[in-house]
């Protein structure tokens, strides 16, 4: 018989994890299980328990993480990876919306994220969402345009920003925006 | 909220003894090294001691093997330098570090990680 099925992986309450907070890792595969491991890619680095609980969040933390269990001698297959993010390791952007954070429901609004230091990455956040704001095939960039704004798109925004080199070393997020469609 | 907490430094003349130890507050720790780092004014700071948790293996550096020895207590989160026939040169300020995650390095390896880290304890050792 062929591998067993990949367990889930996840990050409690988020993966999103400001410096010094507390954040647990947790991997589930079916009841009965022998064994987890859970390692953090690109490292040397991994525990043989399904939880990791961080109690205040730290740089070298910051990474890959995946997990896999095992059952007399058969192994899973490795469950998707989980971003683990530190945030907050530098100074907060500024978001903006032009022409306006207020705008017509077809109109078009751009929000821009910008940062004093040479940053060559950003992320936008709705609130709500579980995941980035993402545009096809580029989704970190300093400008965000929605074309045809309607009304799901009112909410509010956050952006971070933060460096290529170092991808899970995170600003502080931006002063949120509240994008108003009416 | 996790933190180390040093203590036991001071001034002691040379070939004499101190014993610095380390304990760890906060929510639920756990760790799979606990280490002792030290930095000298003007220098990098350098790996001193370690001991894992599980098994209680111990590490040194070169440098200070046969005179200091590395211990846990009898709770889970604390552990001891016992620095015997001093020298000038241990004087430094000495850190306890400790790591979350297990390592397919052993804790005395440069690649190895340490995720937490006290203020430091001076020690000062006068000839």
């Known amino acids: 018989s062929g591998p067993l099925p990949k367990p889930s992986l996840q990050a409690l309450p988020s993966s999103l994890v400001p410096l010094e907070k507390p954040v647990t890792l947790r991997c589930q595969g079916p009841p009965g299980v022998d064994l987890y491991r859970l390692e953090k890619l690109s490292s040397s680095r991994y525990q043989d328990q399904a939880v990791l609980f961080i109690p205040a969040m730290k740089r070298s933390l910051a990474g890959r993480y995946r997990c896999s269990y095992q059952n007399g001698s058969l192994w899973s297959l490795p469950s998707d990876q989980l971003e683990l993010v530190a945030t907050g390791v530098f100074a907060k952007p500024s978001l903006s919306a032009q022409p306006g954070p207020a705008v017509s429901s077809g109109g078009d609004v751009t929000l821009q994220c910008q940062t004093r230091y040479g940053f060559d990455q950003f992320a936008l956040y709705k609130e709500g969402d579980p995941a980035p704001y993402k545009n096809p095939e580029r989704w970190y960039r300093a400008s965000f345009p929605i074309i045809t704004v309607t009304a799901a798109h009112s909410g509010t925004y956050r952006c971070y920003s933060f460096s290529s080199r170092d991808p899970y070393l995170w600003s502080a997020p931006s002063d949120p925006l509240e994008l108003v469609v009416t | 909220q996790v933190q180390l907490q040093e203590s036991g430094g001071g001034l002691v003349q040379a070939g004499g003894s101190l014993r610095l130890s380390c304990a760890a507050s906060?929510?639920?720790?756990?760790?799979?090294?606990m280490g002792w780092f030290r930095q000298a004014p003007g220098k990098e700071r350098e790996f001193v001691a370690a001991?894992?948790?599980?098994?209680?293996?111990?590490y040194y550096a070169d440098s200070v093997k046969g005179r200091f020895t590395i211990s846990r207590g009898n709770a889970k989160n604390t552990v001891y330098l016992q620095m015997n026939s001093l020298k000038p040169e241990d004087t430094a300020v000495y850190y306890c570090a400790s790591s979350l995650l297990n390592s397919y390095y052993p804790p005395d390896h440069t690649s190895y990680e340490y995720d937490y880290w006290g203020q430091g304890t001076q020690v000062t050792v006068s000839s």
């Open positions: 001991i894992r948790w599980s098994g209680g293996s111990t």
């Open positions: 906060g929510r639920t720790f756990s760790s799979d090294a």
